[in-house]
Every structure is written in structure tokens, then in C-alpha cells.
């Protein structure tokens, strides 16, 4: 199986025990790693951060010791802009710049890979979207020709029914992709002006539609129908939670809440929390399972956060196992327990360590 | 440059009330920071007393100290403990902290409380 | 309500000695490694030097050491200095953060 995880760049900026750098990571616990983002200027691939590139050098170091990992560079991400990607893939020029770009960049800098992250084509960019990804392919094929090991291609996809029928040709995609990974977590947020879990295995109780769609459940399931190759889906398990602040005494699922959580001490952004924060928030609170989701939740004062825990991925490894998918993906590492002090365990990692420790499990 | 300084502290008659305030300064409340009342009679070791998770609002008290005293974030950089029935016992040199468990700990000086008549 | 035991109070050592402070718990940390130590100066505030039981604080020489887990941890200081004279807190968090509590401290002496 694989089990593709999740760097970001920007977590090195994050204060005291928060700051990730890529010697960090463990180089045996993923079979891929991705570094998250490239950017893209002048319709070429460029680096984001002013020291991306001693970043990358640090993250392909891994491989030194670990011949077998995989690193790939994501491109895009959410501060990239859906229009800016819109542009250059609806442009057969832009287009083939940036695809001519891409080779040399992962070759110098020493990745795999190049990973696809617009987030999200519009309904107009459909079949740009494709295009783009059938071309980098055949550019990564006749790239390799040399007697080189070709490089891979991926992409992470959105979960959301609504952006799944808009956004992508998953039967067509899927043919010239490496691997897909499909974004199975943000499926509640504080728009809904209720509490819910972002990440819920299954199908709510109480889900009527358009909720009975928001759910892991439910968008593999509709992947797979679409023409996805099992072989191909890797499963996201987010190593993060969602938080909102209650607007009543009611704590619940469905509860009323005045808007996402306070920012976390050391990712500070509202409504969201890594691992690592949430094992302290722990300290003092009450933690129920949503059932039927298998899932968990915790409550402490005015503040509620849904979040996974060891139970909960391994019960999405069981899932995707029985699914046949070809393994899970992380949404990040830079988020878990990545010191191993604040989980309490004395173990780096433990949520993904404890995916792979699920997906090697017979 | 982050900091926490104490007022209110001074002398106060036995069965008094007196609130003390710790005031942050260089950053706010608008995060999840642990915010904790301290306190140390003349020669002897440090006490805690109470404290509040800025980011649930939930507080926590010292068996000893509850009913007697309140903690409460008054605004997004100040954090109260109101302390009531004063007797002789409460003299002492009360600290606010920030963060006792984290690297991103913080302590203010402190303020002096006597209570004596 | 978990009780916090420091060990011994006082010590004494020679400058460029070792000094080896205990705390005891008598139930678990959370986490097994919610515990700080202080070092306190009199008329100054405590200062942070280890938290987590084991990870040192921004600033703090790497001559203090911190170990241990759940009930038993220990603050070591090593190559004394003359500058390390103050008494010595742990203070252990837990489950339910009104059972958190300092130790009774230990006054180490350099001589």
C-alpha cells in the first residue's frame, strides 16, 4: 500500500514547538513524501518560500538513507488561486511552457514527482484540467526516454460531490495519473452554522441530503463509480481538526455555534487544529465518538473540535482495505505529533505512524 | 516584546476582597494560552491557585482555593483573580503565568499582597 | 488531590559538580510527560527551564537535564556554576488541571 504524506512549507514559520522542518520527518514512515507548494511564475514552475530550495535539498536528503521513498513537489495549493491555474492551462502556450518547465525543475532539485494541487478547476476548466494532465504525462514520458526512471504524476482531488461533477473527468484523469488523492476531510465547516465532524467515515444518522454526501463513505464510493481505478485512489486521513466555538449550552453533533474555533497556540488559524494541539486540548475536556461516523469529537468550555484519532484511522485503513484502494493519504505530517511530545506517547507521528502500522497489519 | 505585569496587590484588612489584574502585553488572548494565578508566602514555595484556558474559558481551581477566589478573562489582554474572606494565610507575592507546560512560558514580576490589620 | 514530592532539600555541591534533583508524583502525569521545572531566585520570578519532562527551554544551558515519565522525573545539573544557586520547582499537570501542582522545591546550594 501506499501511504502518501503531506509537507508543508509554510510550517517551518510556526513558533517554538510548532516550526517543522523537513529533517524532521521520519524517512521510513511514508512510501511517498509531497512537499507542499510550488508556485508558478511567468509560466514556469518557480519555488514559493525564500529558502524552498535548502527545503528541498533537506526533504531529498531523506532518500539517502531510504533509497525507496518517493518525493514529489505539489504545485498550486489554496493561496495559488483557482483563476491563476485557470489561465495557464486554458492557454495552449502557457500550457506548454509550464509543462516544458517542469521536468528540469524536479530533476535538478531532486524529486520524483510533480503533483497537481488546483484547488479548484471551475466548471469551464474541466476539460483544461484534463488536457494538462494528459500533456505533463506524455512530456514525463518522452522526458524519460534516456533511460531515465520517469517521473510520476499525481493529483489531489476534492471530495465534494458538487466540485467532483464540476471539476474533473475522473475516468479520463485517471488514465494518465500516477495516483489520485482524493481530499477526504473539510466536508463540514463553519458555514454550516452547526457542529459537525470534517472527516466522517460514514454517513451521519441524521444526513439528509446534501449531508449524505459529506462523508469518506460516500465520495469513494462515487470516485470509483466515476471510473476511478482502485488501484489508483489513495484516501486522505487529515492529521488535523475542526473546531468551532458553541453558540448554546447544546455541545452535540448539529449543535448551534457562533463561528469556527479559537486559533490553535501554534498553527493560529481559527477553526482549525493540529494533532498536536488537540492532544492538549484534551487535557480537561470531553471526548465522545460519533458512532455511526466513527469518529471522535471533543468538547471543553465554549470550544468543540472533530478530529481523528488511532481508532479512527485505523478504522479508515480497514476501510480503504476493503475497498482495495491503493492506500491512504496524510494531510500532514508537519501537523501530527511530529516531536513526540505533545501525544504523550514517546512515539514521533502517531497518527500516521499509526496508518502504517494499519495498512502493514494482515 | 511579550510580557505580563500584576496590579492591584497592596494591603487589605482580614475578611477583605481585593481583584488583582495581570495585563498582557505583545500579544492577546485570542488564542489558546493557559493562564495561571500563583502565588508565594514570605520564605515559602510557590502555590497555584487557579487558572483559565483563554481559548474555552473553562477555569480551574486549587481545592483549597475554591469558592474564595474567581478567575475570569476580563478582556482579550487581562486576565482577574478576585479574592475574597482574606485572612492572614493569603499574605503572599501572587504571580500570573502564561503557559506552564510550553516553551512559550511567561511570568509577570508579581504584586504583593499583605492582609493584616 | 496528586501529590508532588521534590527531593532532597537542600543540596550542596562544589562548583563544576553534579546535582541530581527528583520529583515524584503519586499518580501520572497527563500525557505521562506534563511536568515543568522552575528555577527561582529570591525576589524574581521562576524561570522556565525544562517542560515536558524532558525538553529545554529557549535560552537554558544545556547543562540542566530533564528525564523521566508518568510518576518519576529528574532534573539534572551538571558543571555547576555558582550562577545555578536558587531553589529548585517541578510542577506536574494533569487530567483534570485543578489536580496541577507544584513540588515543595529544593534548595541547592553551591559551594
Known amino acids: 500500500y501506499k501511504l502518501v504524506c503531506y509537507y508543508t512549507s509554510w510550517s517551518q514559520y510556526r513558533e517554538g514547538d510548532g516550526s517543522c522542518f523537513p529533517d524532521a520527518l521520519d524517512r521510513f514512515l511514508c512510501t511517498h513524501i509531497i512537499y507542499s507548494f510550488a508556485n508558478i511564475s511567468n509560466d514556469h514552475i518557480d519555488t514559493w518560500e525564500w529558502n524552498d530550495v535548502t527545503l528541498y535539498g533537506m526533504l531529498n536528503t531523506l532518500k539517502n538513507r531510504n533509497p525507496n521513498l518517493k518525493t514529489l513537489l505539489s504545485v498550486g495549493g489554496w493561496n495559488f488561486g483557482s483563476q491563476r491555474f485557470s489561465k495557464i492551462a486554458s492557454n495552449t502556450q502557457s500550457r506548454r511552457t509550464f509543462i516544458k518547465s517542469v521536468p528540469p525543475f524536479l530533476r535538478t532539485h531532486g524529486f520524483d514527482g510533480l503533483d497537481l494541487a488546483w484547488l479548484y478547476p471551475g466548471r469551464r476548466d474541466k476539460q483544461h484540467f484534463t488536457t494538462l494532465i494528459k500533456e505533463m504525462k506524455a512530456e514525463f514520458i518522452k522526458e524519460a526516454q534516456p533511460g531515465k526512471k520517469q517521473l510520476l504524476l499525481s493529483a489531489a482531488l476534492s471530495a465534494g460531490k458538487v466540485t467532483i461533477d464540476s471539476s474533473y473527468d475522473i475516468a479520463k484523469i485517471s488514465q494518465h495519473l500516477d495516483f489520485i488523492s482524493i481530499m477526504t476531510y473539510d466536508f463540514h465547516g463553519a458555514w454550516r452554522g452547526t457542529t459537525g465532524h470534517h472527516s466522517p467515515l460514514f454517513r451521519g444518522q441524521e444526513d439528509a441530503s446534501p449531508d449524505r454526501f459529506s462523508n469518506t463513505d460516500y465520495a469513494v464510493g462515487y470516485m470509483l463509480r466515476l471510473g476511478a481505478p482502485a488501484s489508483k485512489l489513495v484516501m486522505g486521513i487529515p492529521t488535523f481538526g475542526r473546531s468551532f466555538t458553541l453558540a448554546s449550552s447544546e455541545t452535540g453533533v448539529g449543535a448551534p455555534i457562533s463561528g469556527p474555533g479559537i486559533p490553535g497556540r501554534f498553527t493560529k488559524e481559527a477553526g482549525t487544529l493540529a494533532y498536536y494541539e488537540i492532544c492538549d486540548f484534551l487535557r480537561g475536556a470531553t471526548v465522545h465518538r460519533i458512532l455511526g461516523q466513527q469518529v471522535p469529537y471533543a468538547t471543553k468550555g465554549n470550544q468543540w473540535v472533530g478530529y481523528d484519532d488511532q481508532e479512527s484511522v485505523k478504522s479508515k485503513v480497514q476501510y480503504l482495505k476493503d475497498r482495495q484502494l491503493a492506500g491512504a493519504m496524510v494531510w500532514a505530517l508537519d501537523l501530527d505529533d511530529f516531536q513526540g511530545s505533545f501525544c504523550g506517547q514517546d512515539l514521533r507521528f502517531p497518527l500516521t505512524n499509526a496508518i502504517k502500522d494499519a495498512l502493514a497489519a494482515t | 516584546q511579550e510580557q505580563l505585569v500584576e496590579s492591584g496587590g497592596g494591603l487589605v484588612t482580614p475578611g477583605g476582597t481585593l481583584t488583582l489584574t495581570c495585563t498582557a502585553s505583545?500579544?492577546?488572548?485570542?488564542?489558546?494560552?493557559?493562564m495561571c494565578w500563583v502565588r508565594q508566602a514570605p520564605g515559602k514555595g510557590l502555590e497555584l491557585i487557579a487558572a483559565?484556558?483563554?481559548?474555552?474559558?473553562?477555569t480551574y481551581y486549587a481545592s483549597w482555593a475554591n469558592g474564595r477566589f474567581t478567575i475570569s478573562k476580563t478582556s482579550s489582554t487581562t486576565v482577574t483573580l478576585q479574592m475574597t474572606s482574606l485572612t492572614a494565610a493569603d499574605t503572599a507575592t501572587y504571580f500570573c503565568?502564561?503557559?506552564?507546560?510550553?516553551?512559550?512560558?511567561?511570568w509577570g514580576p508579581g504584586t504583593l499582597v499583605t492582609v493584616s490589620s | 488531590d496528586p501529590m508532588l514530592t521534590q527531593t532532597p532539600s537542600p543540596v550542596s555541591a562544589a562548583v563544576g559538580g553534579t546535582v541530581t534533583i527528583t520529583c515524584q508524583a503519586s499518580?501520572?502525569?497527563?500525557?505521562?510527560?506534563?511536568l515543568s521545572w522552575f528555577q527561582q531566585k529570591p525576589g524574581q520570578p521562576p524561570k522556565l527551564l525544562i517542560y515536558?519532562?524532558?525538553i529545554l527551554a529557549s535560552g537554558v544551558p544545556s547543562r540542566f537535564k530533564g528525564s523521566g515519565s508518568g510518576t518519576q522525573f529528574t532534573l539534572t545539573i551538571s558543571d555547576l556554576q555558582c550562577d545555578d544557586a536558587a531553589t529548585y520547582y517541578c510542577?506536574?499537570?494533569?487530567?483534570?488541571?485543578?489536580?496541577?501542582?507544584f513540588g515543595g522545591g529544593t534548595k541547592v546550594v553551591v559551594e
Open positions: 503565568a502564561r503557559d506552564p507546560y510550553f516553551g512559550t512560558n511567561l
Open positions: 505583545g500579544f492577546d488572548f485570542s488564542s489558546y494560552y493557559y
Open positions: 483559565i484556558d483563554t481559548g474555552s474559558g473553562e
Open positions: 499518580q501520572s502525569v497527563y500525557n505521562n510527560n506534563y
Open positions: 515536558k519532562a524532558s
Open positions: 510542577l506536574g499537570g494533569y487530567s483534570s488541571p485543578s489536580d496541577d501542582a
